[in-house]
């Protein structure tokens, strides 16, 4: 593996900046293979940082071509079974050393993220990733570590609820230390280094390795390449191995077979048919997530990638949480949908970003002919008579106060009450008394009814009531109208987007 | 040199169904969200609907106005992607191109489709 | 879904001519807005994106500006074969919408 300035990037840079000595680290973050790797999601699937790391000192005119890595393995271990697809990152830190440095001080050189298909106990695949004007080439591989076994380290141990329970000769499960090891369900004999099981009394073998216990080396079997070694004694079985024996794809890819041929997945920066042919270009795509790649129409130039919406990171791999920097005003509630930001916003507030208040109670419907009455910086609902509530949905009963004076009997109407007055007492509610001797009503009653018959006298009211509540309700209703108008475009604007974003969320 | 080429374009009826095929070449195509955008005779251009990769699910999403109607999905190993119209009206008549990427990089040359009684 | 509105739909110039296209979108879209061209019998082509940036291979003619909800193309000096409609898209929210167009002719 190396690390350092890529072909044709003109005089290779130190990568300690003229500031004295410095030391490079490499941090190996494994995540679920998913295209839209969130920036604030953890490496899901496990994480490492390389050690044993040798001092680069920068010295006059030398070149940086080479410098000096990390030692041996960086080793990731993985506690679930391998998924086969996965995004690896690799981060290039820079360790700053010295006394003038203020202490070690430590930056991101470079990042890499790229999508792989791996099957665990393949052989290592190689890979070269560039970013700006660094270039690092390295080499991956995914092996299980016993008694998890094949392509995707499927366990082969038994559940148990604490390792203090397991059976005679049975030890804890590894790297399941809950379980119990199961005793062993393989072929007798079949090798432990170069051979597992996926059901019970079978063998089968890893890359470079056959025979019936997978003890046999590919190239020292007595069969033909195009042959498969039988049971002992029995020579060679026929049909030969399967379009993917051998691996054909080259630089990582991982093969799949397609009726009777193969094809081959290449890691980003290779294709061809074998993934034999390197160099990033903008026809190979190497832009996440829809990106623009710009530039890079040969191997040799750059390319930069414009991301979408919600997308950053030099491959667009890398998902900004746009709801962070709170885009919805007026205490909306933020949604960020991949592909679009959607507002919800709190009532009496409208727009893409609940910028719009509606003020004049046009975001405020009142039911039942209520009317919206501002004050105080709030809204609320002054409710026609038989009607209450915040929104003046809730049926009120006009006669539970008991508002007809004087033993009057009160009656619910559909646009409030009406007082049937006793004997000796008259007006809207009963207030009046009126003198039986025709002296004056206490208090004092208009002239011209003061003889009259109280049944008549009742019918007058009734019709004042009548013609009162005709005009009033003709009011309203020219309110309601006029109103209902001016918020019909904001509640369809409302309705359209919350339908959008019921779609969308379904999405 | 990247070249994408529609083909599948006719003359249906209202109600009639076509299949649109675009076959990409020069470009590593499982690595391209792909998109259809028509135009109608004289007229601007819409976006019809997008399919993403594998390792999206190949995850579709559609314009309202064919929503239901019309179904895009690919084949990695022909380098091709298609658009099925079923039902289709006399307004889905247009030109129809396929085209990459979330901002429309590569475009092809367009297939023309007619719906008229 | 955002509209945009380009102005104007049509405008004749000569070679040489400084033109100026204008979109403007129904709410803010960013910077996330691209220009195309296209020539008669043609697909369009994608010339500037990010409000500003010019694509690989087009012009220094050509180039774009604005944020927000106002954009602007210019083509500082008219050559023949810049004859064509250019229309504006926004990219800012899905679905991505395109302006009318505008036909620039020869005068």
């Known amino acids: 593996h190396s690390f350092g300035p890529g072909p044709g990037l003109g005089t290779p840079r130190s990568p300690c900046n003229a500031r004295g000595p410095c030391r490079l680290f490499f941090r190996v973050c494994l995540k679920p293979g998913v295209s839209q790797e969130a920036t604030e999601s953890l490496c899901a699937l496990g994480a490492a940082l390389s050690t044993s790391v040798p001092v680069y000192t920068e010295h006059p005119g030398e070149s940086a071509a080479a410098l000096p890595l990390p030692d041996g393995l960086v080793r990731v271990p993985f506690r679930d079974a391998w998924p086969g697809t996965f995004s690896l990152v690799i981060e290039t830190w820079r360790e700053q050393l010295g006394e003038h440095a203020g202490g070690p001080a430590w930056n991101l050189l470079a990042r890499v993220v790229g999508r792989r298909r791996l099957a665990a106990g393949g052989p290592w695949a190689r890979d070269v990733q560039r970013t700006g004007t660094w270039e690092l080439h390295f080499s991956y591989r995914a092996r299980c570590e016993p008694p998890a076994v094949g392509a995707a380290c499927a366990r082969l141990c038994r559940s148990r609820s604490a390792p203090s329970r397991c059976g005679p000769g049975l030890r804890p499960c590894t790297p399941f230390p809950d379980e119990c090891e199961a005793p062993s369900v393989c072929r007798p004999g079949c090798s432990p280094e170069h051979g597992y099981c996926e059901e019970p009394d079978e063998c089968r073998c890893l890359e470079g390795w056959t025979g019936p216990l997978c003890t046999v080396p590919v190239s020292t079997s007595s069969c033909l390449n195009s042959r498969v070694p039988g049971p002992a004694s029995t020579g060679c079985l026929l049909p030969g191995p399967g379009p993917c024996d051998g691996n054909p794809c080259a630089n990582g890819g991982s093969c799949s077979e397609t009726s009777g041929s193969f094809e081959c997945a290449c890691p980003r920066g290779f294709y061809g048919l074998r993934c034999e042919v390197s160099g990033v270009t903008c026809a190979d795509g190497p832009c996440f997530n829809g990106g623009l790649c710009v530039g890079g129409e040969d191997p040799d130039s750059a390319y930069v990638c414009h991301c979408p919406p919600g997308f950053q990171g030099s491959n667009c791999e890398k998902r900004v949480d746009r709801c962070s920097l709170q885009p919805c005003q007026n205490g909306g509630l933020c949604l960020d949908l991949g592909h679009a930001l959607r507002c919800r916003c709190r009532a009496g507030f409208a727009g893409p970003r609940c910028e719009h208040d509606l003020d004049d109670c046009a975001g405020r419907a009142c039911a039942n002919g209520g009317t919206c009455v501002e004050g105080g910086g709030s809204r609320r609902c002054s409710c026609a008579l038989g009607f209450g509530g915040r929104d003046c949905r809730e049926r009120a009963d006009p006669c539970a106060s008991r508002p007809c004076a004087h033993g009057g009997r009160c009656y619910a109407h559909f646009s409030g009450l009406v007082c049937a007055c006793a004997p000796g007492y008259m007006g809207v509610r009963c207030e009046f008394a009126v003198r039986p001797d025709g002296a004056d009503a206490v208090p004092a009653a208009p002239r011209g009814l003061r003889q009259a018959d109280p049944q008549r006298f009742l019918a007058g009211v009734i019709a004042v009531i009548v013609v009162v509540v005709i005009a009033i309700v003709a009011g309203i209703v020219v309110l309601v109208i006029s109103r209902k108008k001016r918020m019909a475009k904001y509640e369809k604007a409302e309705i359209k987007e919350m339908g959008e974003m019921h779609r969308e969320l379904n999405a | 040199e990247v070249q994408l080429v529609e083909s599948g374009g006719g003359l249906v009826k209202p109600g009639g169904s076509l299949r649109l095929s675009c076959a990409a070449s020069g470009i590593t195509f499982s690595n391209f969200w792909m998109n259809w955008v028509r135009q109608a005779p004289e007229k601007g251009l819409e976006w019809v609907g997008q399919?993403?990769?594998?390792?999206?699910?190949?995850?579709?999403h559609y314009a309202e106005s064919v929503k239901g109607r019309f179904t895009i999905s690919r084949e990695d190993s022909k380098n091709t992607v298609y658009l099925q119209m079923n039902s289709l009206k006399t307004e889905d008549t247009a030109v129809y191109y396929c085209?990459?990427?979330?901002?429309?990089?590569?475009w092809g040359q367009g297939t023309t489709v007619t719906v008229s009684s | 879904n955002i509209q945009m509105t380009q102005s104007p739909s049509s405008l004749s110039a000569s070679v040489g001519d400084r033109v100026t296209i204008t979109c403007k979108a129904s709410e803010n879209v960013g910077t996330y807005v691209s220009w195309y061209q296209q020539k008669p019998g043609k697909s369009p082509k994608l010339l500037i994106y990010?409000?500003?940036n010019r694509y690989t291979g087009v012009p220094s003619r050509f180039s774009g500006s604005g944020s927000g909800t106002d954009f602007t193309l210019t083509i500082s000096s008219l050559q023949p074969e810049d004859f064509a409609t250019y229309y504006c898209?926004?990219?800012?929210?899905?679905?991505?919408?395109f302006g009318g167009g505008t036909k620039v002719e020869i005068k």
């Open positions: 990010g409000a500003s």
């Open positions: 085209t990459t990427g979330y901002y429309f990089d590569y």
């Open positions: 898209g926004q990219f800012y929210s899905f679905p991505s919408t």
């Open positions: 399919i993403r990769l594998k390792s999206d699910d190949y995850a579709t």
